[in-house]
């Protein structure tokens, strides 16, 4: 695999992650955080190694920023578990809250 295809996957993966985070903000639905974390990572990882790499870099950066701003350790662990769940190819719908609109 070429460096350029890895880069392309990373770019698409970053876009998947961005879309999941922006959907999460738009939905503003109690109990949906883990679903969106899993979905973003799942979609990115499906792109290939570059996508999985981008997902990991973005989630790590996000965790560090949240930690800096005092995000709870328990919430952080739950988010990490959901990130890893999606990145490993498991169905994000496992975390889907009842009634979350289908557009998400």
């Amino acid at each position: 695999r070429s460096f350029f295809s890895f880069l392309g996957e990373a770019f698409d993966g970053a876009r998947d992650m961005w879309r999941a985070y922006s959907d999460m903000r738009e939905a503003n639905y109690i109990g949906s955080d883990k679903y969106f974390h899993a979905r973003g990572n799942y979609d990115a990882a499906k792109r290939g190694p570059g996508g999985a790499w981008a997902a990991e870099v973005i989630t790590d950066a996000r965790e560090n920023i949240q930690r800096f701003f005092g995000h709870g350790a328990e919430d952080s662990l739950a988010d990490q578990a959901a990130n890893e769940w999606g990145r490993s190819g498991k169905d994000p719908n496992h975390f889907r809250p009842a009634g979350l609109p289908e557009k998400y």
């Epitope: 109690i30 109990g31 169905d91 496992h94 889907r96 809250p97 009842a98 979350l100």
Partner: antibody, heavy 121, light 107 residues
Framework: QVQLQQSGAELVRPGVSVKISCKGS????????MHWVKQSHAKSLEWIGV????????SYNQKFKGKATMTEDKSSSTVYMELARLTSEDSAIYYC??????????????WGQGTLVTVSA | DIQMTQSPASLSASVGETVTITCRAS??????LAWYQQKQGKSPQLLVY???TLAEGVPSRFSGSGSGTQFSLKINSLQPEDFGSYYC?????????FGTGTKLELK
């Protein structure tokens, strides 16, 4: 203790609609999703869908979209399911079951006693 | 949709015997499986969730095992109250689906 009390049996004509209810007690109603399950001789147990008791939004099994509509009334801790355009295929026992959380994916530790719906001309 | 297939469809056994019911998922559901018992004219009752966690109040003669696509429910030393129907159900993705059922009858 947790209890789910369902409405009584219904005998209805083909083509009409029926609305059945399930009242939850003994727990915080909006903390758990409520699911509906159909049991018929032909198909054993089938998951119809689930309602988010906090928001009142429902998620349905594709197979039951257009057939079932779920609603809730927080003030009475009651969920409802309306079944439309009934046919003999809809004759079954319908159970409400409390989810293990607000997620769709769930096991069911608490079930209502079931509501028998019979569709007959 | 994930298909859940149980075997056998029915079995006869005597009090005191040990029986095993199996459930096969059409795709990997990891350990997200529940088992229920249902007696004639009654609602199903949860026995096991997460493949092997016994629900509250369930006797220890019941045990669940398996992961991935193959699961089983074992009942040691059958008691008269254990006869009835048994169903498995996955709680992994959507839609949730139940097994075809196993009827356990007294020999």
């Amino acid at each position: 203790q947790v209890q789910l009390q369902q409405s009584g049996a219904e005998l209805v004509r083909p083509g009409v609609s029926v609305k059945i209810s399930c009242k939850g007690s003994g727990y915080t109603f909006t903390d758990y999703a409520m699911h509906w399950v159909k049991q018929s001789h032909a198909k054993s147990l089938e998951w119809i869908g689930v309602i988010n008791t906090y928001y009142g939004d429902a998620s349905y099994n594709q197979k039951f979209k257009g057939k079932a509509t779920m609603t809730e009334d927080k003030s009475s801790s009651t969920v409802y399911m309306e079944l439309a355009r009934l046919t003999s295929e809809d004759s079954a026992i319908y159970y409400c079951a409390r989810g293990s959380s607000i997620m769709i994916t769930s096991w069911f530790a608490y079930w209502g006693q079931g509501t028998l719906v019979t569709v007959s001309a | 949709d994930i298909q859940m297939t149980q075997s056998p469809a029915s079995l006869s056994a005597s009090v005191g015997e040990t029986v095993t019911i199996t459930c096969r998922a059409s795709e990997n559901i990891y350990s997200y499986l529940a088992w229920y018992q249902q007696k004639q004219g009654k609602s199903p009752q949860l026995l096991v969730y997460n493949a092997k966690t016994l629900a509250e109040g369930v006797p220890s003669r019941f045990s669940g095992s398996g992961s991935g696509t193959q699961f089983s429910l074992k009942i040691n030393s059958l008691q008269p109250e254990d006869f009835g129907s048994y169903y498995c159900q996955h709680h992994y993705g959507t839609p949730l689906t139940f097994g075809t059922g196993t009827k356990l009858e007294l020999k």
